[in-house]
């Protein structure tokens, strides 16, 4: 007897973090034997959607023409072949930005920092929130993700970086969110440019990267650098 059908793979275009109102396409790729594809959304009646395969039958397209809160969440897909239904895909987490007003991002003591020293990026929201994310521009996914210990609402989160190196230089933004749905994020903060200069001991300028890229897959968070935050928030990796 043949083993279980291989599970399909699930991904989003242009990616899995989508601004309110923008379009997104979810792709489910199975096998050439697929006759039908099914997309399930966590905490929604199943199936969330069904699609016939596109030629040559190894994938299906699920289109969301305008992103709203209703579409944010965790998805899995399946395909049906002549021998039955496949195992579920690994989950895809579709996140919407623009759900809340934008926070403010600042650097303490200054956005101009000497290599080897310390700097703290401070993300502040007007209303109390319990989750804060820091994104470095041109990274593919969250750099740091802070969540309060007991759902306590706070107006800010601190992202300390120590010791700072040239790799920390670049453009940052932060988001805030409520814990009841970490698939809904605020508008992004205005950008903060962190400029790292050469160390006091070494007057030579530190090398800089014009493009800082993420170290891991699109759907996995970067591991952080830096010490434990000084706020009442703790690090939390999705």
């Amino acid at each position: 007897q043949a083993g279980p059908l291989p599970k399909p793979t699930l991904w989003a275009e242009p990616g899995s973090v989508i601004s309110w109102g923008n379009s997104v396409t979810i792709w489910c790729q199975g096998t050439l034997e697929a006759r039908e594809y099914r997309l399930d959304k966590e905490e929604s009646p199943a199936p969330w959607d069904r699609q016939n395969p596109l030629e040559p039958k190894n994938k299906a397209r699920f289109s969301i023409p305008s992103m709203t809160e209703d579409y944010a969440g965790r998805y899995r897909c399946y395909y049906r072949s002549p021998v039955g239904w496949s195992q579920p895909s690994d989950p895809l987490e579709l996140v919407m930005t623009g759900a809340y007003s934008k926070p403010t991002l600042s650097a303490l003591p200054s956005p101009l920092v000497t290599s080897g020293k310390s700097v703290t990026l401070l993300c502040q929201s007007r209303s109390p929130m319990d989750t804060f994310l820091l994104i470095k521009e041109r990274a593919a996914h969250p750099l740091l993700h802070l969540r309060s210990e007991h759902g306590a609402q706070q107006h800010q989160a601190e992202f300390p970086m120590s010791p700072v190196t040239s790799v920390h230089g670049g453009t940052y933004r932060c988001f805030s969110s409520h814990g009841f749905s970490h698939y809904l994020l605020s508008h992004p903060s205005d950008p903060l440019e962190l400029i790292v200069s050469g160390s006091l001991e070494d007057p030579r300028p530190s090398p800089t990267r014009s493009v800082s890229t993420a170290a891991g897959p699109e759907d996995q968070p970067l591991m952080p650098t830096g010490s434990v935050p000084h706020s009442g928030l703790r690090r939390h990796w999705e």
Epitope: E13, G15, S19, S23, T97, A139, A140, P191, A214, E218
Partner: antibody
Framework: QVELQQSGPGLVKPSETLSLTCTVS????????WSWTRQPPGKGLEWIGY???????NYNPSLESRVTISVDTSKNQFSLKLSSVTAADTAVYYC?????????????????WGQGTTVTVSS | DIQMTQSPSSLSASVGDRVTITCRAS??????LAWYQQKPGKVPKLLIY???TLQSGVPSRFSGSGSGTDFTLTISSLQPEDLATYYC?????????FGQGTKLEIK
């Protein structure tokens, strides 16, 4: 700084398979989308297809029956194979990276390109 | 599939002129549009992404606008080095179709 280095033959015989490889240096292939585009002599750009690090692919419908794009994360490479080539497939072939998520809420365009490989289909 | 139509296909302008190139999608693509510059014999270069965001290192005389189906690339003051062919490209969802290109010549 991420760089893309293309390799592969510049001359392919009709009905054979064109094979090109793009090696990613200065960064990991395990993020973003990695694509191939071509440009026939004196003509415009034609998108061929993409892969991501997991090997998920999408292709230009006009080429779908002949094209395969694959990824080898252990070698930081992705490859293009185009079967049953004819003179109409003579072109400069480019590999490129499509930028990832930017904190502004935007996704980038194809921001890093290979040097291009001129492929001539001729017997 | 969504078609991308650029206009004009070619144009000639003088140094210092303001130049506008348009790109129209046959269906809405949100702001998932990029503009590229390709100089003769060279590799394409990303100018604008997300319809209006200037790529790092690109001169500020280049700007982009639009959302949905209608997009514009503007060069505020044409320079001799801007001689090139310009392409738009959608990247909302595969296929990532290019426009047919606009060849810009300097008078």
């Amino acid at each position: 700084q991420v760089e893309l280095q293309q390799s592969g033959p510049g001359l392919v015989k009709p009905s054979e398979t064109l094979s090109l490889t793009c090696t990613v240096s200065g960064g990991s292939i395990s993020t973003y989308f990695w694509s191939w585009t071509r440009q026939p002599p004196g003509k415009g750009l034609e998108w061929i297809g993409y892969t991501n690090y997991r090997g998920n692919t999408n292709y230009n419908p006009s080429l779908e029956s002949r094209v395969t794009i694959s990824v080898d994360t252990s070698k930081n490479q992705f490859s293009l194979k185009l079967s049953s080539v004819t003179a109409a497939d003579t072109a400069v072939y480019y590999c490129a990276r499509r930028g990832g998520y930017y904190g502004s809420g935007n996704y980038g365009g194809m921001d890093v390109w290979g040097q291009g490989t001129t492929v001539t289909v001729s017997s | 599939d969504i078609q991308m139509t650029q206009s004009p296909s070619s144009l000639s302008a003088s140094v210092g002129d303001r130049v506008t190139i348009t790109c129209r999608a046959s269906q809405g693509i949100s702001n998932y549009l990029a503009w590229y510059q390709q100089k003769p014999g060279k590799v394409p270069k990303l100018l604008i992404y997300a319809a209006s965001t200037l790529q790092s290192g690109v001169p500020s005389r280049f700007s982009g606008s639009g959302s949905g189906t209608d997009f514009t690339l503007t060069i505020s003051s044409l320079q001799p080095e801007d001689l090139a062919t310009y392409y738009c490209q959608k990247y909302d969802s595969a296929p990532w179709t290019f426009g047919q290109g606009t060849k810009l010549e300097i008078k």
